[in-house]
Structure formats: C-alpha cells, structure tokens
C-alpha cells in the first residue's frame, strides 16, 4: 500500500480553482525527492503535467503551480481556470511516475452555472457589493417593486419600493428605480455575508401581470493564498480591497480557534504584543491597498491571516477580506543570530546582520523600528556612506565579516537607544531580521577620555584601557567616518592601572597623532575584535585648536572633558516607506544555505546564558 495520501475525489465547476494537497511521510529522502502531478491515460501511462523540478505542461501554463512543504510532509497542486476538459483520473506522487509512491485522484469538473430557467447568476466575493438588476414592462412602471429571497419553500420579502427593509439587511441595502427612460429597477446589497447567498426573485407588480426575474447570488469566501517563508525571515502581505473601502479602517488578523480572528495590527493603532518591534503596516495607497511586513518570523506565526476593512478595525460579518495561509519553514536558510543584544550605558553593541549571500553587492541598511501609529522604520545608516546626523561618530555599518553577514556597531549608548532595530538590504526582502537592544546596569569595559583637544602641529596621545578579559583579542584604534572606521597605528603601553582586580593582562593601548592638522579633528574609536568579528568599542572626539604653548599633549582619563552634546536630528531624515522596502515577490528563489558557524567566544558581544537568542554588549 502506498504511503501517499490525498483526496480520492475532487468536484468543482468550470472557471474555479482547486488546491489538491498530497500528504507523504516526511522522511529526509521524501522531503527532497521530486514531487509530481500526472494524468492517467487510457492505456495505463501517466503523463506529467507539473513537477517540483520546474516542469509545467503546456496544458497548465500560466494556471497551475506545485508547492512542496517539506516541514509538513505535504505538497500542494493549485490548478486555476478549470474546464470540463480537466475532468479525469490523476496521480500525485513522489519520485518517478511509474514507481508505486503515488495516490489516485479523480477530478470532476462540471458545467458552471449559467442562465438556466431565466436565472441570472451573480458571483461576488464576501464583503463586496452586488447589484441585482430587475427589468419590468411599462404597465408595471407605477406598481410596487420588490425583492424576495427563497428560504426553504417560501419567499421572504427582503426590500420593496414602499420602504420596507428586512432586518437582516438593515443599513446595507437599497432599491433604486432608474429614470423614466429605462424600465429597470435595481437592488444594491453591500457588505455581502455568506448567509446572503441563495435564490432571489425580483418582482414588479403584485397581480398575475407582474414581471418576475430570478437571480442566484453566490457569495465566495476567498481562497487563502499559500505563503511559505523561512524561520527568522520576513513576510509581506499585500492587501488590495478596492477603492470602495479606501476610507475605512484596515486590519490584519490571525485566525485562532473557531471563527475568531485576533487583530495583529490595524490602522486604528492596535498591535498585538507578540508582534512588537517586528511589524509595519505600510501607508495605504489612494485605492485603499496596503501591505503589512512581519520580520523575525517564528514557528508560532504560522497560520491563517486575513486582511480586511471595517470601521471597528477588526473582522466583522460583511468585511471584505483577503486570506493567506502562512507556513514557516524551520529548515531555514537564514542563520540564527541573536534576537536580543545587551549593552551598558556609555558602552557599545556590535550587531551581526544576516543577508542573502548571493546578494553581496546589495546595499545594506539598519533602521530603528518605531511603534507610533502603524509602525515605521527610519533609516539610521547604510553601506553607501550615509549616516543619520545624530548618529555621527557612534554608528558604523561594516561589510565584515561578509559572506552573508554584515556588522553594525553602535557606541556611546544611552537608555534612549533601547528598542528594536531591523537589518535589511535592497535585495531579497525576505531577509529582513529584527534585533532588540536592551540597556542593562553596568560599566563600559573600555575606558577612554571624553572630549580631547589637540593642538595644531603638535603630537597627541590618546589612551584606551582594555581590561584583562580582552587579553586574547586584537586591539585597535580607528578614525570614524561615514563609510566605516579606518584603522590607525597604535602603541601597546603595557599593563593598565585603570582596573581594580585586573592582572598584568590588562592593557593600555595609545593612539598617537603626530604633527596634528585640521584634518585630524573628528571621532576616534578604540575597540577589540577577533578576525572579522567585532566586539566592544569606545569613542573619543578630538577637537583641534590653534597652538597656545609648545609641546605635545598626553591625555589621561582624569583630564578628559565631558562628552559632547548629542547632535540634533538633521533634515536629511530618511525612512523605510512603502516603496523602499516593499517587494511583491513573496517567494524567494531557492537560497544557498547560510554560514551558521559559531563565532569565536568573545569575538562579538557575549551570549547571555539565559537564552541562545540573546547576546550581551560586553564580552566575557
């Protein structure tokens, strides 16, 4: 007996779509082997129509796809625009068509509903509007117009021209009688519900000479679109509900048990706590369409999502909706990186950001998530040499270590830096990741003076004290600029006296600037790293002034001035907006497996023992 399972019979009508799910035991071999859908011939063969290796028969071109869900042990064959020619016997299977790993499926496509018995068929999506047109003859022009719904054996009055409205339709129905030239009245029903579906009869006049017209209203619940994204990655739901709801509150909700749909985010300012820091509802276009981006996907994010429009900002009967079924692939190509990074006031953090290594030339960005209104993410820095003004001297985006990871360093931390940050690129939109920076109690590990003033033409020596815990690290000084931090020569001055309980392994490493010029003014960082992995940094601002008295300056910690005031927000403020980070591609190309090797202990801020997903700002 074959271990493959699926629907034995599928019945549909012309013009419809079907989604045929085939289940297989999710062994390693099965998950990665070829999946196929073939049609059985009269003489026993089975001709492939579509397979997971990219083959699509001309019969299915543009109307079918096959999606494998290895995590669930399923694959789904979607076939649209069905015709009666599609009726027949099929197999869904694994491996080679002729081998036994398959399941027989009978597909029967019947004729679509037509104008049978003078019945006009109206097929409308849930939540939308239908206009039922009812013609009549001149002799009934002045007579009562009415619409009935067939309930069981009896017609029930829905609306009439004398002003009656059935309570089930209150506030969402109207009867329009066209101008004298047209012998037609119409009934408009808004916010269609599933329960509105059925047989209707419109009538002009009440006697034997009345004009009657039958209508069949079909209300379609939207088929969920299958979305399959990687754990730790990102998903974008594009929601286009039509211009008629452009001014109505929008929402995205996730269906829980039964019919409940818990609001994830809406335009009225509501946001589910589980999505804090990792969701954006992008401003809607004039036509009422909008999109929702969720980053840092978790296993528990999988499920059925609905977007819709309703004044309450949540799902109600009659809301127009769109639906998605989100699957989260745990065999993710996106490497694990800490979701929480901890730093101390005055200290620093080094954040590792993954990106699709196939896109090494893409522009890298880092932005700060803001929860106000629907959420936004103003850019702070990019890999093209742009840094937001008030982050000058304390923020740098480095292409290192490369090969699928870049580094963002932020120092001179204050409590205001606590929050959620997004790593992203202008390439693969699925690789947006989120990291939370937490500011914890403690002292910075590296000790440097505050502001330093150098004298033109003289020599300046600036000290940086490294505690003994960094004895095995590479220590460096560099000069900060918009494109990074250019390494400078430095001198190891031997053990530092700046630390209590620290042995000979502590170090004082000095930066020496000979014959200071105006160009030497700016921010300097001292820091530690191991190979291409960065740890803590400390920043010093060097001001340059005219000579007052000859000699060189040797700055000590005690002589240092206070740190300069934080710079004000500049007018070049940039922000991730609808167009900047949106991309309609919901499905990524097959991605190369990312480098997930552990970084050397302490090569970046240390991992907190409480969680493998947290990393501290100070190394062990």
């Amino acid at each position: 007996k074959s271990p493959i399972f699926g629907p034995e019979e599928v019945n549909s009508v012309e013009g419809n779509s079907v989604s045929i799910t085939c289940y297989y035991p999710p062994t390693s071999v099965n998950r990665h082997t070829r999946k196929y859908w073939c049609r059985q011939g009269a003489r026993g063969g089975c001709i492939t129509l579509i397979s997971s290796e990219g083959y699509v028969s001309s019969k299915y071109a543009g109307r079918a796809n096959l999606t494998n869900f290895p995590e669930n042990g399923t694959f789904v064959v979607n076939i649209a625009q069905l015709s009666q020619d599609d009726s027949g016997r099929y197999k869904c299977g694994l491996g080679i068509n002729s081998r036994g790993l398959s399941f027989d499926v009978s597909l029967e496509v019947s004729q679509g509903p037509g104008l049978l018995n003078d019945t006009k068929v109206y097929t409308v999506d849930l939540g939308r509007t239908v206009t039922i047109n009812c013609p009549f003859k001149t002799e009934n022009a002045q007579k009562r117009k009415s619409l009935y719904k067939q309930i069981g054996l009896y017609p029930v009055l829905v609306i009439d021209s004398s002003g009656y409205v059935n309570p089930n339709y209150t506030g969402r129905i109207r009867l329009d009688i066209q101008g004298t030239g047209q012998l037609l009245f119409s009934v408009v029903i808004n916010q269609l519900r599933l329960s509105d579906a059925g047989q209707y009869l419109c009538q002009a006049g009440d006697d034997s000479n009345s004009n009657k017209k039958n209508a069949d209203l079909q209300v379609l619940k939207p088929e969920p679109e299958l979305v399959y994204e990687d754990l730790r990655g990102s998903v974008t739901f594009h929601c286009a509900l039509g211009p008629e709801v452009a001014n109505v509150a929008k929402f995205l909700c996730r269906q829980s048990s039964g019919e409940n749909c818990d609001v994830v985010v809406n335009t009225l300012g509501k946001r589910a706590p589980a999505f804090e820091g990792r969701i954006l509802l992008n401003p809607q276009d004039k036509d009422g369409s909008f999109s929702v981006v969720i980053t840092g996907l978790r296993k528990e994010d999988a499920g059925r999502y609905l977007c819709g429009a309703h004044s309450d900002g949540q799902l109600q009967e009659g809301s127009p909706i769109q639906a998605w079924q989100l699957f989260v692939n745990e065999e993710s190509t996106i490497p694990r990186s800490p979701t929480v990074v901890k730093g101390v006031a005055g200290g620093s953090v080094a954040v590792l950001c993954p990106y699709n290594r196939k896109e090494s030339k893409s522009i890298k960005y880092w932005c700060l998530w803001e929860g106000a209104q629907n959420g936004r993410c103003p850019l702070l820095v990019d890999s093209e040499g742009w840094v937001k003004a008030q982050y000058e001297g304390r923020l740098s985006l480095l292409e290192e270590p490369g090969n699928g990871t870049f580094t963002v360093i932020l120092n001179q931390l204050t409590s205001r830096d606590a929050g959620f940050y997004w790593c992203l690129t202008n390439g693969d939109t699925l690789w947006r990741t989120t990291v939370e920076i937490k500011i914890i109690e403690g002292e910075p590990n590296l000790k440097v003076p505050g502001n330093v003033t150098a004298v033109l033409g003289e020599t300046l020596k600036v000290p940086c004290h490294f505690p003994c815990k960094f004895s095995s690290y590479e220590k460096y000084w560099c000069k900060w600029n918009n494109t990074g931090c250019q390494a400078l020569p430095s001198q190891d001055e031997g053990p530092s006296k700046a630390f209590v309980n620290c042995d000979e392994n502590s170090r004082l490493v000095s930066l020496t600037l000979n014959l200071v010029t105006r160009a030497d003014e700016g921010w300097y960082w001292c820091g530690v790293k191991q190979g291409h992995f960065y740890g803590e940094t400390a920043a010093v601002y060097v001001a340059v002034e005219e000579r007052k008295a000859a000699g060189s300056r040797d700055v000590s910690l005690a002589k240092a001035d206070a740190a300069p005031d934080e710079k004000v927000l500049d007018s070049g403020f940039r922000e991730i907006e609808n167009k900047a980070i949106q991309d309609p591609r919901l499905f990524a190309e097959e991605k190369a497996v990312a480098d997930t090797r552990d970084q050397a202990d302490g090569s970046r801020a240390s991992v907190d023992s409480g969680s493998s997903e947290e990393q501290g700002g100070s190394s062990r």
Partner: nanobody
Amino acid sequence: EVQLVESGGGLVQSGGSLRLSCAASGRTFDQFTVGWFRQAPGKEREFVTAIRWSGSTTYRYYADSVKGRFTISRDNARNTVDLQMNSLKPEDSAVYYCAGQMSQWSDPRGDDYDSWGQGTLVTVSS
C-alpha cells in the same frame, strides 16, 4: 462553539447498508472539513472518511478499508454531512464519531479537529 450530533446508528446484518448523519448546531455549517472516525472496543480511534469544501469545490478522502463501500456527502439544505455505508462487514462495527475542522491544510486523517460529536454505535452482525 459548534455542536455536532451524529444519528443513524443501529444494528444491521452483514452486507447491509446504513446511513449516518452529522448535524451541526450553534452556527452555520461552513467548516472547511468534516471527518468521520470510528472506534471499536479495545482499539484505537481510526479515520474513516472526510469531506472538505471551499466555495463550490469539494474534496473527499477515504481510508483504504472503506474505499468503494462508503460514500461521504454534504447536504446543504439540512446542514448535515452524511455517510452512506454499503456492503457492511462485522469489522465495521464501532462507535462512529463526526468531527469538524477549521483548518483547510491539516491532514484530514489527523486528530487536530476543533469539535467532536458524542458518537453513534454501529453494530454489524454476521
């Protein structure tokens, strides 16, 4: 919360037929999937058949042991899902349960159904 009630069980001779019904109350029967399961004394509950619908498309699933003998159908007017059982065998004797499932993607043979009926007893005598 939807309540499911099975009916139609009883005693029947081997080779005979029986029709079980699963009626929904509490709200309209617009669940995506309704399945029939059975449990014989001292045995584990097993999947029998399921019907899944979405708009005007219907998917029917059967266990190997009942293929060709049992037919599942949906009656919109009565708001029921019916199980027509022909060519009954003594090994079909069991308590038959119907279950409703919201998810359109779960394996219909699985146990992640949202609501279950109390069951109806079917006895097939030889």
